[in-house]
Amino acid sequence: EPPTACREKQYLINSQCCSLCQPGQKLVSDCTEFTETECLPCGESEFLDTWNRETHCHQHKYCDPNLGLRVQQKGTSETDTICTCEEGWHCTSEACESCVLHRSCSPGFGVKQIATGVSDTICEPCPVGFFSNVSSAFEKCHPWTSCETKDLVVQQAGTNKTDVVCGPQDRLR
């Protein structure tokens, strides 16, 4: 595609190239043959993040505590507010418009990856030799107790939900 009639950071209006408003400012009036583009800074709690010809600035996002949200990064005239979730909660979408409680890993499953403000807990089934007997958002699968290192023997086999039960070795009479 060939370049357009107006350069970067310009726009075409009524047969002339006018300067776009810089980020953080909105358009008040287009340029004319005799005047420059007129721009005004965005107000408090407003922003525009690109070179633009918008006549209204966008409102900063509101991090609603009733939805479990809090401010991660305060907005400026050039950037929107970034929300994240309260401790123990995570965003339901990339836009982080609401939060849900972190999921817990059921018995038989351990935490593979602890949840963050933007991602849920990732669980994995406990493999042979490991168990989890609690519902938790933090606990990994624990290895079965090694009876041998305690000079004990396995009295009850472990499962993915229970540890092995160790007991004393039978004495030879």
Epitope: A5, S15, Q16, E33
Partner: antibody
Framework: QVQLVQSGAEVKKPGASVKVSCKAS????????IEWVRQAPGQGLEWIGV????????NYNEKFKGRVTLTADKSISTAYMELSRLRSDDTAVYFC?????????WGQGTLVTVSS | EIVMTQSPATLSVSPGERATLSCRAS??????LNWYQQKPGQAVRLLIS???RLHSGIPARFSGSGSGTEYTLTISSLQSEDFAVYFC?????????FGQGTKVEIK
């Protein structure tokens, strides 16, 4: 004073191409856009495209895309409009105009007749 | 594209009378509306740009008004040299588009 002087009338056969020139004087050629418009006999005005003579950037009416080419030669303050694959309904007066706030100054027009 | 509709198609007026020409856009054009005069054998002339700005050298009897989608060209007292065809044109959104014209003729 601002003047736009266009090349003379042309008669072309269907399928041929035509190149109309527009020589500007009386202002800084690279400071204003050049617009191209046509008017078929007894009809209204139809916008073809616009060129920035400063660096050759263009915008075309979708209707003419692929058939029209706008160019400019800064050294002689002249803009050109070339229309290819001519059809009988391209018969019209072709105008160049200097931009500003609107089409501020117009050329006298160039009659292009397409006939077999 | 934005469709420009002019009315009336022909306006018959006596010299010295007032003439009012209308132009309607199919959507809001934010005052980017220009008026042109065309006479046989002469170059097209810009009369008014951006709704109401009189172009250099144009007599003050020509004036423009309007907003949104409705615009008006007024010639307060018609002179003999004002009998011509008048076109409106929007400069808000590509492709630029023109009205079909209003012919102002002697009554």
């Amino acid at each position: 004073q601002v003047q736009l002087v266009q090349s003379g009338a042309e008669v072309k056969k269907p399928g041929a191409s035509v190149k109309v020139s527009c020589k500007a004087s009386g202002y800084g050629f690279t400071n204003y856009l050049i617009e191209w418009v046509r008017q078929a006999p007894g009809q209204g005005l139809e916008w073809i495209g616009v060129i920035n003579p400063g660096y050759g950037g263009v915008n075309y009416n979708e209707k003419f895309k692929g058939r029209v080419t706008l160019t400019a030669d800064k050294s002689i303050s002249t803009a050109y409009m070339e229309l290819s694959r001519l059809r009988s309904d391209d018969t019209a007066v072709y105008f160049c105009a200097r931009g500003g706030s609107g089409f501020a100054f117009w050329g006298q027009g160039t009659l292009v007749t397409v006939s077999s | 594209e934005i469709v420009m509709t002019q009315s009336p198609a022909t306006l018959s007026v006596s010299p010295g009378e007032r003439a009012t020409l209308s132009c309607r856009a199919s959507q809001d054009i934010s005052n980017h509306l220009n008026w042109y005069q065309q006479k046989p054998g002469q170059a097209v002339r810009l009369l008014i740009s951006s709704t109401s700005r009189l172009h250099s050298g144009i007599p003050a009897r020509f004036s423009g008004s309007g907003s949104g989608t409705e615009y008006t060209l007024t010639i307060s007292s018609l002179q003999s040299e004002d009998f011509a065809v008048y076109f409106c044109q929007q400069g808000n959104t590509l492709p630029w588009t023109f009205g079909q014209g209003t012919k102002v003729e002697i009554k």
